[in-house]
């Protein structure tokens, strides 16, 4: 079941999936001046069996000006840096989710890929949040959102990360320093 909505945006934070559940789709988008090859896939799909998951289909981009040239999928590390949704700015890796059964790793970039990846997530997908540069988390607890099915509708749980900037901190003297650093993450709740 696809999630109806995108993961929630929260102020001064970005999110990232560490791995993608089977059924996740990634649009084959090309950067400006390039387009999908005529017979090319619309999306990549995370599929698998009990022991192994991988991305089906390949995304291929060709110059809008040239009709015949095709560009194969080749990793381009420098392009990886451009994409908002595929980069994390800190070593936050709560779980090596890519090693979980039924999950695919981040697909390698393809040549002339668009700067931002568009994923279509499925129920059960988890994304992790972190504060953008210049902001810090108010506490050291879990910071994620999970796509769940509730009352027949899909919804993302509310991330519990609050990011604050220096200016805001000085306005709020009521902050007390964390005394502990609990591990774990919000438990799943019974709904309905």
């Amino acid at each position: 079941e696809l999630c109806d909505d995108d993961p929630p945006e929260i102020p001064h934070a970005t999110f990232k999936a560490m791995a993608y559940k089977e059924g996740t789709m990634l649009n084959c988008e090309c950067k400006r001046g390039f387009r999908r090859i005529k017979s090319g896939s619309l999306y990549m799909l995370c599929t698998g069996n009990s022991s192994h998951s991988s991305w089906d289909n390949q995304c291929q981009c060709t110059s809008s000006a040239t009709r015949n040239t095709t560009k194969q999928v080749t990793p381009q590390p420098e392009e990886q840096k451009e994409r908002k949704t595929t980069e994390m700015q800190s070593p936050m890796q709560p779980v090596d989710q890519a090693s979980l059964p039924g999950h695919c790793r981040e697909p390698p970039p393809w040549e002339n890929e668009a700067t931002e990846r568009i994923y279509h997530f499925v129920v059960g997908q988890m994304v992790y949040y972190q504060c953008v540069q210049g902001y810090r988390a108010l506490h050291r607890g879990p910071a994620e959102s999970v796509c769940k099915m509730t009352h027949g509708k899909t919804r993302w749980t509310q991330p519990q990360l609050i990011c604050t900037g220096e200016m805001e901190t000085s306005q709020f003297p009521g902050e007390e320093k964390p005394q502990a650093s609990p591990e774990g993450r919000p438990e799943s709740e019974t709904s309905c």
Partner: antibody, heavy 116, light 107 residues
Framework: EVQLVQSGAEVKKPGESLKISCKGS????????IAWVRQMPGKGLEWMGI????????RYSPSFQGQVTISADKSINTAYLQWSSLRASDTAMYYC?????????WGQGTLVTVSS | DIVMTQSPSTLSASVGDRVTITCRAS??????LAWYQQKPGRAPELLIY???TLESRVPSRFSGSGSGTEFTLTISSLQPEDFATYYC?????????VGQGTKVEIK
């Protein structure tokens, strides 16, 4: 089922102290922010402050800073709102709610009446 | 603090009417806005978050729109149980702030 259950109504005199409670159940209490919201008679909602029970990090709205204290005891899944010296203007309904950004679950409210 | 201003303060309407409530923020809050409904003697209930995302139990006659500084809550066809007070709340910047409320009453 997620539930927030608040302590009962209180009638107090000005200058007295008070601590009201909000007990969470049906979820991992330590991993979710709890906010306190005031509603004075016939008035709107005012966000007072918020606490993360896992490590007791607390933030207050500037309007309530120094007026109240928010705390939590994670061993009994309970958040508290307290006053050291009540005033008549503290008469209101007080709600706890699970956040941190928007509030999906609310307590039933605790009515605090301060009168001489 | 970001100031949230709702209009109108009171709205008289009949069952079946289309009702629109406006909420304005004193500065841009992107889509970090929630709407609540409160009935007398009851705790508020979340209707909408992220300006337009309907909470799972909320009937589809409710909808939210807007971004930046101007937002609207629309009830497409007012039902008897919808007579209540409605509040908008921003969560873009600490401290979260709430509009003064709009009371929807029977005409």
């Amino acid at each position: 089922e997620v539930q927030l259950v608040q302590s009962g109504a209180e009638v107090k005199k000005p200058g007295e102290s008070l601590k009201i409670s909000c007990k969470g159940s049906g979820y991992s209490f330590t991993n979710y922010w709890i906010a306190w919201v005031r509603q004075m008679p016939g008035k709107g909602l005012e966000w007072m402050g918020i606490i993360y029970p896992g490590d007791s990090v607390t933030r207050y709205s500037p309007s309530f800073q120094g007026q109240v204290t928010i705390s939590a005891d994670k061993s009994i899944n309970t958040a508290y709102l307290q006053w050291s010296s009540l005033r008549a203007s503290d008469t209101a309904m007080y709600y706890c709610a699970r956040g941190p950004y928007y509030f999906e679950y609310w307590g039933q409210g605790t009515l605090v009446t301060v009168s001489s | 603090d970001i100031v949230m201003t709702q209009s109108p303060s009171t709205l008289s309407a009949s069952v079946g009417d289309r009702v629109t409530i406006t909420c304005r923020a004193s500065q841009s809050i992107s889509s970090f806005l929630a709407w609540y409904q409160q009935k007398p003697g009851r705790a508020p209930e979340l209707l909408i978050y992220k300006a337009s995302t309907l909470e799972s139990r909320v009937p589809s006659r409710f909808s939210g729109s807007g971004s930046g500084t101007e937002f609207t809550l629309t009830i497409s066809s007012l039902q008897p149980e919808d007579f209540a007070t409605y509040y908008c709340q921003q969560y873009k910047s600490f401290s979260w702030t709430v509009g003064q409320g709009t009371k929807v009453e029977i005409k």
